[in-house]
């Protein structure tokens, strides 16, 4: 009778497995920035170092009674979820607690910053094994808190944060909105988003994945053997921090980018009922529930990709949206999406030495999203080939002309504002393998990569009849790197990747006007990495 | 996950009204002031002064000291609560909001953020 949350995130084959680093000792250290904790609790006793760090605001109210067990409640529970002997995810992982939240669970951005700096100082004074920082707290969007998380992440520390319990867009909160943080939303025993009173888990593009966060049994600070259930995105984040600690125990050299990609790749997909989220957030919110991934030794050199959505561009005529990959990741393709369908396409450009995915709004449009496909491609050498728009009626062809480079994605960007005059671009997988083909007034961008054993192919699926969307999936063993819509009708909303599925969205009115001869096609570029093979295009 | 969320950013590029000091008069604020969009979560009176990324250790201390000196000239007492060296260059200061215009004009300042609450989730 294992608690539901542990059963959910730890597959059967891991249940009895002890995660140890190659030299036999678990050297991962988790830092918890939260309330004070009860270190003598049976679950965590001997595993927790209560640092002397304390940076909290005064409690509100003149009649506030500071009761130790209440002051310790939140932190003790989370420490138990991470490393508790009996109900913890990473049983036995050593944990350091820093007090940044007072007895009422309130802290400050400045106190959190000083806490993060304390961790950095500790790291400099006494370098150790991998560090995981758990941030089970949230405040309003803070540029400096996000920046501090970015700086700490760049030193090799893995930060895991609660998405927030405000039933709102996580991008409006910090540290949840920091791209370098693994941001975790909460689900219940039925894998549904957690409701907390009138509120609930946050959602949106700033959430990386979900994890158990409802009725989680863990250490209670009421007594040294007490347990209680608590709910929230803090509990969800604690599960992921525990998973990360276990992953790093086995493989201490895993980077933040690898950890995030593996968490996403091995999570349980499509079990969350997305109808719980506001309609405009459904496409942006990942349908992923965390599970402990197998080690890299068991899974080989799989090509891992994730989808990164930009912020909404806003409705102005020249509004652009920008989606960025993490520094270690390769941007293999860029697409765009607009709810009104009024967009001028997408392209890849270099900003400050990094390739970014950009999308442009069209006149009368309500705004666009840029959708980047970010992948881990060992020893990759990627470049962008682009061709300016062709003269009226002519096609523009772009292919990967360097030896051993394969096409991983295509982008199209229209110079003209008038949506009615242009015929939309296409990918050609037959007569001209590995080419992006654009039509009238479209600039075409081909993303070309060389990496040992990288091979790619195009897979298309078209629907002639009325349909709001067309999808095409890459088969097992292949990973979706590029996704485009090749429309028969004039107006498409765009295309984006959901895990290994390429989704092409069509405007309702276009769907109604369409004649049977004009198929809307979802075109996917599917790649795989076979380290022994050389780069190739598969027809 | 981008640079700016639902965030209040106020440009306080006020013309210098200092005591005729050349370096002060010449420096027009390009730094911005930021604060939490949720008013109830704000902590007015405490500010995180964030300096440009390449700012050296000594310059951080000098900037904090310069702010104290200039504030004192105007009859304000400010308290530097913490200096950040290791994660980013900057300092935490307790001061009147009247001094924000002055602080934004200091050399090396990239932006100033008003402190705000965070909550257990």
């Amino acid at each position: 009778s294992i608690p539901w949350n542990l059963e959910r995130i730890i597959p059967a084959w891991h249940q009895t497995e002890e995660d140890r680093s190659p030299d036999g000792s678990s050297q991962v250290e988790v830092y918890l920035l939260d309330t004070s904790i009860q270190g003598a609790h049976r679950e965590i006793e001997g595993r927790v170092t209560i640092t002397d760090f304390n940076s909290v605001p005064e409690e509100d109210g003149t009649r506030f009674h500071r009761q130790a067990s209440k002051c310790d409640s939140h932190g003790t529970h989370l420490a138990g979820v991470v490393s508790g002997r009996d109900a913890g995810v990473a049983k036995g992982t050593s944990l350091h607690s820093l007090r940044v939240l007072n007895c009422q669970g309130k802290g400050t951005v400045s106190g959190t910053l000083i806490g993060l700096e304390f961790i950095r100082k500790s790291q400099l004074i006494q370098p150790s094994g991998p560090l995981v920082v758990l941030l089970p707290l949230a405040g309003g969007y803070s540029r400096i808190l996000n920046a501090a998380c970015r700086h700490l992440a760049r030193t090799g520390v893995v930060l895991v944060a609660a998405a927030g319990n405000f039933r709102d867009d996580a991008c409006l909160y910090s540290p949840a909105s920091a791209p370098e943080v693994i941001t975790v939303g909460a689900t219940n025993a039925q894998d549904q988003p957690v409701t907390l009173g009138t509120l609930g888990t946050n959602f949106g593009r700033c959430v990386d994945l979900f994890a158990p966060g409802k009725d989680i049994i863990g250490a209670s600070s009421d007594c040294s053997t007490c347990f209680m259930s608590q709910s929230g995105t803090s509990q969800a984040a604690a599960h992921v921090a525990g998973i990360v600690a276990r992953m790093l125990s086995r493989e201490p050299t895993l980077t933040l980018a690898e950890l995030r990609q593996r968490l996403i790749h091995f999570s349980t997909k499509d079990v969350i009922n997305m109808a719980w989220f506001p309609e405009d957030q459904q496409v942006l919110t990942p349908n992923l529930v965390a599970t402990l991934p197998p080690s890299t030794h068991e899974t080989g050199g799989q090509l891992l990709c994730r989808t990164v959505w930009s912020a909404h561009s806003g409705p102005t005529r020249t509004a652009t949206a920008t989606a960025r990959c993490a520094p270690e990741e390769e941007l293999l393709s860029c697409s765009s999406f607009s709810r009104s369908g009024r967009r001028r396409g997408d392209w890849i450009e270099a900003i400050g030495g990094q390739q970014v995915c950009k999308a442009l709004n069209a006149f009368g449009g309500e705004g666009v999203y840029a959708v980047a496909r970010c992948c881990l491609v060992p020893r990759a050498n990627c470049s962008i080939h682009n061709t300016p728009a062709a003269r009226a009626g002519l096609e523009t062809h772009v292919h990967c002309h360097q030896k051993d480079h394969v096409l991983t994605g295509c982008s199209f960007h229209w110079e003209v504002e008038d949506l009615s005059v242009r015929r939309q671009p296409a990918l050609r997988s037959r007569r001209q393998p590995g080419q992006c083909v654009g039509h009238q007034a479209a600039s075409v961008y081909a993303s070309c990569c060389h990496a040992p054993g990288l091979e790619c192919k195009i897979k298309e699926h078209g629907i002639s009849g009325p349909s709001e969307q067309v999808t095409v999936a890459c088969e097992a063993g292949w990973t979706l790197t590029g996704c485009n819509v090749l429309p028969g009708a004039s107006l498409t909303l765009g295309a984006y990747s959901v895990d290994n599925l390429c989704v092409a969205r069509v405007h309702d009115t276009a769907r109604a006007d369409r004649t049977s001869g004009e198929a809307t096609v979802a075109a996917a570029i599917c790649c795989r990495s076979r380290p022994s093979a050389k780069a190739s295009w598969v027809q | 996950q981008d640079e700016d969320g639902d965030y209040e950013e106020l440009m306080l590029a006020l013309p210098s009204q200092e005591d005729g000091l050349a370096d002060e008069a010449a420096h027009v604020a390009t730094a911005t002031f930021r604060r939490c969009s949720k008013e109830a979560w704000r902590l007015p009176g405490t500010y995180i002064v964030v300096l440009m990324e390449e700012t050296q250790r000594l310059q951080i201390e000098q900037t904090a000291h310069r702010l104290q000196t200039r504030a004192a000239r105007r009859g304000y007492v400010i308290k530097v609560l913490h200096i950040f060296y290791d994660l980013f260059p900057g300092f935490l200061v307790k001061m009147s909001s009247d001094l924000l215009g002055l602080a934004l004009k200091l050399p090396h300042v990239e932006y100033i953020e008003e402190d705000s609450f965070v909550f257990a989730q």
């Epitope: 009996d86 049983k91 007594c223 040294s224 347990f227 | -």
Partner: antibody, heavy 126, light 106 residues
């Protein structure tokens, strides 16, 4: 009905290690619902908790005895055992084994020692 | 560690009388206190847990009360089989037992 039975030598020499085993019948030591504990009672005195262990290998000891105590659970034999090293005459006592709810599974009942074995007297003497 | 002090050390009463046993903790144990009964040559038996809840099979004449630092075990009308030693135990911080109260026949 769950029953616990202590067994082991009744006489141990000073500085040696006291070893006792508790055999569980009518239930399983590998249940996630319970800890398995040892409590002792010197002749004519009160009770003292020694420590508790979980099927997974988790242990939890009285701080005053921690350096000398080892409790382990053998799920294959449905037993748990106590080892107390470097014994002195002060360790002479009746040693009881008992079950304690782990708290991990709230429905398992109160988080106290219940039931107990009938106890075994161990005398430390040369 | 939390020290539990039981009083009186010995209580001499007749069958049918009311017995009131006290247990005082050196610091608050909230309601994390239990009472056990031990008869000569037998193991202790759980009577009351979490200060006031009767364990399975325990007669209604046994009741517990209190929270924080002061607790009471009451036996409303003593039966012959109730004459024994009674121990309190806390689990707020680790596990400690009181020194015991012996209830003997007057």
């Amino acid at each position: 009905q769950l029953q616990l039975q202590e067994s082991g030598p009744g006489l141990v020499k000073p500085s040696e290690t006291l070893s006792l085993t508790c055999t569980v019948s009518g239930g399983s030591v590998s249940s996630s619902s319970y800890y398995w504990g040892w409590i002792r009672q010197p002749p004519g005195k009160g009770l003292e908790w020694i420590g508790s262990a979980y099927y997974s290998g988790s242990t939890y000891y009285n701080p005053s005895l921690k350096s000398r105590v080892t409790i382990s659970v053998d799920t294959s034999k449905n037993q748990f055992s106590l080892k107390l090293s470097s014994v002195t005459a002060a360790d002479t006592a009746v040693y009881y084994c008992a079950r304690e709810n782990s708290g991990v599974v709230p429905a398992a009942g109160p988080n106290w020692f219940d039931p107990w074995g009938q106890g075994t007297l161990v005398t430390v003497s040369s | 560690e939390i020290v539990l002090t039981q009083s009186p050390a010995t209580l001499s009463l007749s069958p049918g009388e009311r017995a009131t046993l006290s247990c005082r903790a050196s610091q608050s144990v909230s309601s994390y206190l239990a009472w056990y009964q031990q008869k000569p040559g037998q193991a202790p038996r759980l009577l009351i847990y979490d200060a006031s809840n009767r364990a399975t099979g325990i007669p209604a004449r046994f009741s517990g009360s209190g929270s924080g630092t002061d607790f009471t075990l009451t036996i409303s009308s003593l039966e012959p089989e109730d004459f024994a030693v009674y121990y309190c135990q806390q689990r707020r911080n680790w596990f400690t037992f009181g020194g015991g109260t012996k209830v003997e026949i007057k």
